[in-house]
């Protein structure tokens, strides 16, 4: 009964606190996408290898607006979507020479979220309503994870390590409040 992925009434999957995000099924017109291999980080190696090219874990960067009901974020957010199959590829000889093949009975590796970050976004709502905010949980990095034959698709949502937390017992900063303050939301499973 945790926060689960949900599709709201807009045209995108919004990764909130309900679930770790999945790749967006539909993208808004003004979204941009660019690709980076591992975001400049060395790949996560399930096995020791001298050939890093054997491991592929792509991080696709999506920029989109967050929506909630009739509201839309004042600014777009950028998130990662983990994509692609991970190695290791097996080098097997054949008549032509050394060619990479996937070993049929080898372990299965998937490119899945590794770390997450929460970002607070201000929502613009119709009718001059009080400002509202929400926190969206975004993928910060991807990794290759080895799956055994006991894993299934639902277990691909890897509950990996959290990002570093702030110092203990921070006092709230005083804040000059206007007529209204920003807000944010959460949700309770039935």
């Amino acid at each position: 009964q945790g926060w689960q992925a949900f599709k709201n009434d807009a045209t995108e999957i919004i990764p909130g606190l309900r679930e770790y995000p999945e790749p967006p099924q539909e993208l808004e017109n003004n979204q941009t996408m660019n690709r980076a291999e591992n975001g400049g980080r060395p790949p996560h190696h399930p096995y020791d290898t001298k050939d890093v090219s054997e491991y592929s874990c792509r991080e696709l960067h999506y920029t989109r607006f967050v929506t909630d009901g009739p509201c839309r974020s004042a600014k777009p957010v950028t998130e990662l979507v983990c994509s692609g199959q991970c190695g290791p590829a097996r080098l097997l000889p054949n008549a032509i020479g050394r060619v990479k093949w996937w070993r049929p009975n080898g372990p299965d590796f998937r490119c899945i979220p590794d770390r997450y970050r929460a970002q607070r976004v201000q929502l613009l709502c119709p009718g001059g309503a009080a400002p509202r905010s929400r926190k969206v949980r975004l993928v910060a990095s991807c990794k290759c994870k080895r799956l055994t034959r006991f894993h299934n698709q639902s277990e691909l949502k890897d509950f990996g390590p959290e990002t570093a937390r702030p110092q203990k017992g921070r006092k709230p900063r005083p804040r000059a409040r206007g007529a209204k303050a920003n807000q944010a939301e959460l949700e309770n499973a039935y």
Epitope: W3, G16, L17, A129, R132, K135, K171, P172, Q183, L186
Partner: antibody
Framework: QVQLVQSGAEVKKPGASVKVSCKVS????????QHWVRQAPGKGLEWMGW????????EYASKFQGRVTMTEDTSTDTAYMELSSLRSEDTAVYYC???????????WGQGTTVTVSS | DIQMTQSPSSLSASVGDRVTITCKAS??????VAWYQQKPGKAPKLLIY???TRWTGVPSRFSGSGSGTDFTLTISSLQPEDFATYYC?????????FGGGTKVEIK
């Protein structure tokens, strides 16, 4: 599974203060907004305010301004609500709730009964 | 403050009945309305937000509608576990406010 576990019942005298705690598990508190809602015996729900544990931002209902303080300890994922200058009409069950927005209450604690009596 | 007036304050119904609860806001709140269910001695649970969006895991027999000042929560076929008190909440303007509640009792 997201769970919120609140501290036990309190009995206070008028004029005193009470501090209720709310331990959040299943999700880092800094990734949420923390809300407090109270319910007087046999009455409806009353929103008191919300806080953002990550930056210490707060929004309090005007009725409680100056009397309520909402804080969090992000290292223990615990939220606190302190209400001062208690009066008999503050006798109620106090609920913490958490969510990914400032406006709806997704997960709730079990409630803490605060009785103000001389 | 925005007042949320629920009606009826209580109703008696039987399992299988269609139940409708209404909530009227004292001013336009667009669709910034949520509905909660509360059973005796328990914390409330979120059912509906943005007037008509069902929260995770809420059965499809619960539906919400409305905009502006008039809102409705409908239970299409009342189940034994649905006997409870239901509250509407507006989040259009501070402070967030709740309706007085509607108690659904067994006939």
């Amino acid at each position: 599974q997201v769970q919120l576990v609140q501290s036990g019942a309190e009995v206070k005298k008028p004029g005193a203060s009470v501090k209720v705690s709310c331990k959040v598990s299943g999700f880092p508190i800094k990734d949420t907004f923390q809300h407090w809602v109270r319910q007087a015996p046999g009455k409806g729900l009353e929103w008191m305010g919300w806080s953002d544990p990550e930056i210490g931002d707060t929004e309090y209902a005007s009725k409680f301004q100056g009397r309520v303080t909402m804080t969090e300890d992000t290292s223990t994922d615990t939220a606190y609500m302190e209400l001062s200058s208690l009066r008999s009409e503050d006798t109620a069950v106090y609920y913490c709730a958490t969510g990914d927005t400032t406006y709806k209450f997704d997960f709730w604690g079990q409630g803490t009964t605060v009785t103000v009596s001389s | 403050d925005i007042q949320m007036t629920q009606s009826p304050s209580s109703l008696s119904a039987s399992v299988g009945d269609r139940v409708t609860i209404t909530c009227k806001a004292s001013q336009d709140v667009h669709t910034a309305v949520a509905w909660y269910q509360q059973k005796p001695g328990k914390a409330p649970k979120l059912l509906i937000y943005w007037a008509s969006t069902r929260w995770t895991g809420v059965p499809s027999r619960f539906s919400g509608s409305g905009s502006g000042t008039d809102f409705t929560l409908t239970i299409s076929s009342l189940q034994p576990e649905d006997f409870a008190t239901y509250y509407c909440q507006q989040y259009s303007d501070y402070p967030w406010t709740f309706g007085g509640g509607t108690k659904v009792e067994i006939k």
